[in-house]
């Protein structure tokens, strides 16, 4: 009896440029004789429905059709047919199929590979063309993938114990695609410093599929003027 097991949930998520291991475990009723086994990995792109061979292993032959692709013969002895792909790129996302043939038995499994890129975030103060006591803060998020991203602005005044989401005077621009396939976006907050309490902390909060916790960049209103804080992307303590 031959069985193949892939990543639970059927999806693997990996960061862009990572050396990814796509899991495939073989379960066989007898000890695995790799000389009598054939392992083939296939890839189907998200954009077109054609399956392409990525790697094959049988007997003493192994061939990578994607540069750097490898299945470890040592691990294969213990039933681990996982495929290692160094420097994974965005366009390599899609469906990967692990096909195993041992003697007269065959089994296969598929997994979806998602490649994500985490945004970098920075705060900029733009006072050009602004009125007296008015400032524009720009929160730039760059190099992220996929395109879906959520940018919000929050403030916490001196007196209140928790942040408050700001919806007025916020404009988030369109996402712009970079040459490498990643995206950039800028969100702007317009502030009238004369109407705000000194000591109020503002932060731009970026939420994206690639992030376990939101990316935060903050600044504090000082009595004199707004000051960008020393530490952008601070942790949120509570």
């Amino acid at each position: 009896d031959l069985k193949v097991e892939m990543m639970a949930g059927g999806t693997q998520i990996t960061p862009l440029n990572d050396n990814v291991t796509i899991f495939c475990n073989i379960f066989y009723s007898q000890p695995l004789n790799i000389a009598a086994a054939a392992i083939t990995w296939f890839w189907k792109s998200l954009t077109f429905d054609k399956e392409v061979k990525v790697f094959e292993f049988f007997g003493d032959h192994q061939e990578a059709f994607r540069p750097g692709a490898i299945v470890s013969p040592w691990r294969l002895k213990s039933g681990d047919a996982s495929l290692r792909l160094p420097g994974i790129q965005l366009e390599e996302a899609g469906e990967y199929r692990c096909e195993v043939v041992v003697a007269a038995a065959a089994a296969q499994g598929t997994v979806q590979l998602e490649v994500v890129a985490s945004p970098a975030s920075r705060l900029l103060l733009d006072q050009v063309g602004m009125k007296e006591n008015e400032d524009k803060y720009m929160c730039e998020s760059s190099g992220f993938y996929p395109e879906a991203i959520n940018i919000t602005w929050e403030k916490q005044t001196q007196k209140f114990p928790h942040p408050i989401e700001i919806s007025e005077d916020v404009i988030t621009g369109p996402t712009i695609k970079n040459m490498d396939g990643t995206f950039n976006v800028t969100s702007c907050l317009k502030l009238n410093s004369s109407q705000e309490d000194p000591g109020t902390v503002y932060q731009c909060v970026v939420r994206h599929a690639s992030l376990h916790t939101p990316l935060r960049s903050n600044f504090t209103l000082t009595a004199a003027r707004h000051s960008l804080s020393e530490t952008e992307k601070t942790d949120n303590f509570s």
Epitope: P161, I164, G199, N218, N236
Partner: antibody, heavy 117, light 107 residues
Framework: QVQLQQPGSVLVRPGASVRLSCKAS????????MNWMKQRPGQGLEWIGG????????DYNEKFKGKATLTVDTSSSTTYMDLSSLTYEDSAVYYC??????????WGQGTTLTVSS | DIVMTQSQKFMSTSVGDRVSVTCKAS??????VAWYQQKPGQSPKALIY???NRYDGVPDRFTGSGSGTDFTLTITNVQSEDLTEYFC?????????FGAGTKLELK
Amino acid sequence: QVQLQQPGSVLVRPGASVRLSCKASGYTFTNYWMNWMKQRPGQGLEWIGGIYLNGDSTDYNEKFKGKATLTVDTSSSTTYMDLSSLTYEDSAVYYCTTRGDYFGDFWGQGTTLTVSS
Amino acid sequence: DIVMTQSQKFMSTSVGDRVSVTCKASQNVGKYVAWYQQKPGQSPKALIYSASNRYDGVPDRFTGSGSGTDFTLTITNVQSEDLTEYFCQQYISYPLTFGAGTKLELK
């Protein structure tokens, strides 16, 4: 990291007064507002009042006006709450809480006040 | 004063279950609601702010929802350490007010 130090427990007689302290460290003390909360077993939490830590502003829950007085000693980064004319109903855990330099609130470990004859 | 009502003082659940703690405000508080967890002998710890935003470090099994007057804290895949007390708090205006608390206990 913000830390708020409070004495663990205080025992006082009915009718007496008591001063509870809350010493802050790990952030710019005078920039912020300090709240005080009361918690009696099984009765949830109540906001007593708050004080701006440069000492120039206080705010009280109507229910605690005349009962609680908040003061601050900036030199020792300590906030005080004086409770007067104590009764058994004043037996509770009292917490100080502040925003600190980042988002979210920080709580002291609380002082258990026991009013008993 | 704004009254925050947590109608259930106790709720029974099992490890691995999903449980929802509810809170009702006596008037519209927008999204200005926080949820606290308090373990015995400890001070309260904020989990959620703005009704649905998790503080960093809070496990994603904790989810807040609601706006206006009705709010919910949902815990999916309840862990043994989650079996404790939860409070809601409004912070749209002073005096800050809290719900009376809901204690999660083992079924």
